[in-house]
């Protein structure tokens, strides 16, 4: 969590934003709060990206005004427009690129003063894994498949009975580039499953880590997936 | 309220250039993009392209060689250039504002202008 | 460039009826598909944008859904008036691509 004053000739108001990460060809959004103005007219909202001529995003006097939009920007941003009112200045970013990583600043102006926060947006790719009972191979084998992730992730596997045991031995994990040349798809195998265990397939990167369990039982099979992304703090 | 209104069609000789003008009301060409969409006789809806509020264009790589859409904010007008016309660039040619300035549909149309291409 | 397959192409229905227009994209285009109704002579008006979100003013019986590369246009209780062609429409990246339309006729 970044909070930031402004710190001009008039009152300095506080601007809440909040770190996050991106999956690429997805949306995103960009958070940032600040004291709300009763007035809509008299809010101004600048996003601007370190290392970019052009605006990210301006929203002013109830409306967007667009004409310093930086060209990366174009046609992909949006703020929630109904609710900047109620002090939210949060931007919608359309169809995530590598490229948008990087800190952003939300700066604001309202009758109260002038506020600004900055926002670390990291970019990547990240996916819930999915872990299935391969019945195609000769002993029993369990397969967990991810479709989109970047960078490289690491794979590790874990079981609830052989807690703290190492299973890279008698684990394969291969990584296939996607058709897009960016992100890539994980599948790793796990040979010589016991059942009556629960077994976790755990992926992570730098932007998000991922969990698929699966419990095999001789009646029966439960599967379940966790995602988490690993750099949401505040400023 | 929302207005566009799409003028300059009408007949054309093959090779020739076009030039058709939107002329905007009801909001500012500094907030939203304009797209410009033709439909051929019987035909589906074709995107060509789209000017956004900075000025800059985006092109339907099929047309880039012979279109060129800019604008005039202070006359809230956008202009539509498409050079060595041929027989099948007939068509309806329309003006269009996005819904949001995301781009997630086509919220308000001209009503069209008919350019026809024969000698 | 991505494809936007439209289907049927054209169906006959009657008033009353619940009507479904699908829309398969070619690649995943996450909710940027919009939907708009044609009447001869005249421009599309927007029906859904963003997948979902019905436009302003658009009657409650058009709804929208999908996400990814498949999409529904579903009209729950044919009116006299919607009968007209159908379009979908996607605005994720260049160029921009509709599908080929679906005619709506009376039976």
């Known amino acids: 969590l970044i909070i930031g004053f402004g710190i001009s000739g008039r009152h300095s108001i506080t601007v809440t934003t909040v770190a996050s990460a991106g999956n690429i060809g997805e949306d995103g959004i960009l958070s940032c709060t600040f004291e709300p103005d009763i007035k809509l007219s008299d809010i101004v909202i600048q996003w601007l990206k370190e290392g970019v001529l052009g605006l990210v995003h301006e929203f002013k006097e109830g409306k967007d005004e667009l004409s310093e939009q930086d060209e990366m920007f174009r046609g992909r941003t949006a703020v929630f427009a109904d609710q900047v009112i109620v002090g939210n200045a949060s931007l919608r970013l359309k169809n995530v690129q590598l490229t948008d990583a990087g800190t952003y600043k939300c700066y604001i102006i309202t009758s109260k003063g002038k506020g600004n926060a900055n926002l670390e947006y990291k970019t990547g790719a990240f996916s819930m894994p999915e872990v299935n009972v391969d019945y195609n191979a000769s002993s029993e084998t369990l397969r967990c498949e991810a479709p989109r992730w970047f960078p490289q992730p690491t794979v590790v596997w874990a079981s609830q009975v052989d807690q703290g045991a190492n299973f890279s031995e008698v684990s394969n994990t291969s990584f296939e580039l996607n058709s897009e040349n960016v992100t890539m798809k994980v599948v790793s195998v796990l040979y010589n499953v016991t059942i009556n265990n629960t077994y976790s397939c755990m992926i992570e990167n730098d932007i998000a880590k991922a969990t698929g369990d699966i419990k095999v039982t001789e009646s029966e099979i439960k599967r379940r997936s966790h995602l988490q992304l690993l750099n949401s703090k505040a400023s | 309220q929302v207005q566009l209104v799409e003028s300059g069609g009408g007949v054309v000789q093959p090779g020739r250039s076009l030039r058709l003008s939107c002329a905007v009301s009801?909001?500012?060409?500094?907030?939203?993009?304009v797209q410009w969409v033709r439909q051929a006789p019987g035909k589906g809806l074709e995107w060509l392209g789209v000017?956004?509020?900075?000025?800059?264009?985006d092109y339907n790589a099929a047309f880039l060689s012979r279109l060129t859409i800019s604008k005039d904010n202070s006359k809230n007008t956008v202009y539509f250039q498409m050079n060595s016309l041929r027989a099948e660039d007939t068509a309806v040619y329309y003006c269009a504002r996005d819904v949001t300035t995301i781009v997630e549909g086509f919220a308000h149309w001209g009503q069209g202008t008919l350019v026809t291409v024969s000698s | 460039d991505i494809q936007m397959t439209q289907s049927p192409s054209s169906l006959s229905a009657s008033v009353g009826d619940r009507v479904t227009i699908t829309c398969k994209a070619s690649?995943?285009?996450?909710?940027?598909v919009s939907w708009y109704q044609q009447k001869p002579g005249k421009a599309p008006k927007l029906l859904i944008y963003?997948?979902?979100n019905r436009y302003t003013g658009v009657p409650s019986r058009f709804s929208g859904s999908g996400s990814g590369t498949d999409f529904t246009l579903t009209i729950s209780s044919l009116q006299p008036e919607d009968f007209a062609t159908y379009y979908c429409g996607q605005t994720y990246s260049y160029p921009f691509t509709f599908g080929q339309g679906t005619k709506l006729e009376i039976k």
């Open positions: 690649e995943k285009v996450g909710t940027y």
């Open positions: 963003g997948a979902s």
């Open positions: 009801g909001f500012s060409l500094t907030s939203y993009g």
């Open positions: 000017i956004w509020s900075s000025g800059s264009t």
